[in-house]
């Protein structure tokens, strides 16, 4: 019962986590204009992985997609890649874990197969979560570096009468969504791996031990105790699922690359 609960909870937590990773990847607010120096700005800038937006005080919002692929910073491309890998692994993990759930009966699937699938999906969730956390952290690091660079620029070359306002960017909501979602996916993966241990059948076969109490002599059959510890060859453990052999056609939908208001 505890195993089923752990597995089910792991699945739900991972599902929420992956939904969060997808949401974070699609969100436009990865970086938002720092309002420390001007808290009542009439023009507010924010940027995502796929486009940058400007929200005016008038209420109008204009978003522009990053049309170039080669012209984008390598770090941004790396973050995109990490997030997509995280989503793809998470999606495959979810698909695998659905079939691995103890509460779902599919044909005559044995517990050992479900255990393998649970472990596979758990590992996938862990890697997915790590990818998301890594992606968000790389972006955050990039923001911090750029923030201090632009801060340094703000206080140099101010000798002239005309001031040029340098727009600085700080952490956007998507970063926090990404961190939390990645953490949840990671936790869900760990729970799946824990559940896998409970699902794996401990096939300890005790052969009959006969005791004969005939008069004075007690006959004992030696060699009767044979424990299948799992280290030796186990003919009963048939491998019916190969985690690495599964391929999925992932259709990833991105925000529109067209400008719209």
């Amino acid at each position: 019962m505890a195993v089923t609960a752990c597995q089910g909870l792991g699945f739900v937590v991972s599902l929420i986590g992956i939904a969060g990773i997808i949401a974070a990847t699609c969100m436009d607010q990865w970086s938002t204009q720092d309002l420390y120096n001007n808290p009542v700005t009439a023009v507010f800038n924010y940027q995502g992985l796929w486009r940058s937006c400007v929200r005016e005080s008038s209420g109008f919002t204009e978003c522009r997609g990053y049309f170039t692929l080669l012209g984008l910073p390598a770090m941004l491309q790396a973050v995109r890649a990490l997030m997509i890998v995280g989503i793809v692994l998470g999606a495959i993990g979810l698909l695998v874990s659905i079939f691995a759930l103890k509460c779902i009966r599919i044909g005559s699937m044995e517990d050992s197969a479900k255990a393998n699938m649970t472990l596979t999906s758990g590992i996938m969730f862990i890697v997915s979560g790590l990818c998301a956390i890594a992606g968000v952290s790389v972006f955050a690091n990039m923001l911090v570096t750029n923030f201090w660079m632009s801060t340094a620029n703000m206080y140099t070359g101010m000798g002239g009468m005309v001031q040029t306002v340098q727009t600085r960017y700080t952490f956007g909501a998507a970063l926090f969504v990404g961190w939390v979602a990645g953490g949840l996916t990671l936790i869900g993966g760990v729970m799946m791996c824990i559940a896998c241990r409970g699902l794996a059948p401990e096939e300890t076969n005790y052969k009959a031990v006969s005791y004969h109490a005939s008069g004075h002599s007690v006959a004992y059959k030696p060699g009767g105790f044979k424990a299948s510890t799992g280290f030796g060859s186990n003919t009963k453990n048939k491998k019916i699922y190969d985690g690495g052999a599964r391929t999925e056609d992932e259709v990833q939908s991105y925000p529109s690359k067209h400008d719209y208001v």
């Epitope: 204009q33 800038n45 400007v54 005016e56 005080s57 008038s58 209420g59 001031q163 306002v165």
Partner: antibody, heavy 118, light 113 residues
Framework: EVQLLESGGGLVQPGGSLRLSCAAS????????MSWVRQAPGKRLEWVAT????????YYPDSVKGRFTISRDNAKNTLYLQMNSLRAEDTAVYYC???????????WGQGTLVTVSS | DIVMTQSPDSLAVSLGERATINCKSS????????????LTWYQQKPGQPPKLLIY???TRESGVPDRFSGSGSGTDFTLTISSLQAEDVAVYYC?????????FGGGTKLEIK
């Protein structure tokens, strides 16, 4: 055709209060951020206040902050400007304006004259 | 606050001639996010409210004749009337629409020579 019609102007003594109204028609009032702009006789235009479309944000210059309050009633398509502690320098024609792209004041009313004098 | 300075204060131009009005801001009005300049031009005729001519420094408002054009970037901007018409006699104002408080230039009075 978009119409903005200001009302509520008049003569008021220094330290007194006045409430201006701006009735909007022929455009989706609730979608627009709105502003009040004033113009003293023979002087340049001066921005007085702005309110966002959803009423969540209001902005004022230091010259009127704490004395003037901008508000709106989207159900009635009406913009308001509550003016307290009026001074002689607040004497001007007050216009209401609807903000469009580029934060530009796209639609303007005909204005209402506010005279602060003893 | 951003200070807007217009020049000249008044301008007399012959009908059919080009009229040029300048506007200078104390800070850049260029927004890095969309590479647009948040400068607006208005026309005000005597006894009337102002009328929007140009926003984003160079985008003409719908219904505005194409003889009106705006140019410039950063801190220096220009409003040009390519061929002055009698109905163009008015006071022209530039406005900072980039940051609060919104500020207007002192105005340029355009007359016919």
């Amino acid at each position: 055709e978009v119409q903005l019609l200001e009302s509520g102007g008049g003569l008021v003594q220094p330290g007194g209060s006045l409430r201006l109204s701006c009735a909007a028609s022929e455009f989706t009032f609730s979608n627009y951020a709105m502003s009040w702009v004033r113009q003293a006789p023979g002087k340049r235009l001066e921005w007085v206040a702005t309110i966002s479309s959803g009423r969540s944000s209001t902005y004022y210059p230091d010259s009127v902050k704490g004395r003037f309050t901008i508000s709106r009633d989207n159900a009635k398509n009406t913009l308001y400007l509550q003016m307290n502690s009026l001074r002689a320098e607040d004497t001007a024609v007050y216009y209401c304006a609807g903000l469009g792209r580029g934060n530009a004041m796209e639609y303007w009313g005909q204005g209402t004259l506010v005279t602060v004098s003893s | 606050d951003i200070v807007m300075t217009q020049s000249p204060d008044s301008l007399a131009v012959s009908l059919g001639e080009r009229a040029t009005i300048n506007c200078k801001s104390s800070q850049s009005l260029l927004n890095s996010g969309n590479q647009k300049n948040y400068l607006t031009w208005y026309q005000q005729k005597p006894g009337q409210p102002p009328k929007l001519l140009i926003y984003w420094a160079s985008t003409r408002e719908s219904g505005v004749p194409d003889r009106f054009s705006g140019s410039g970037s950063g801190t220096d901007f220009t409003l040009t009337i390519s061929s002055l018409q009698a109905e163009d006699v008015a006071v022209y104002y530039c406005q900072n629409a980039y940051s609060y408080p919104f500020t207007f230039g002192g105005g340029t009075k355009l007359e016919i020579k």
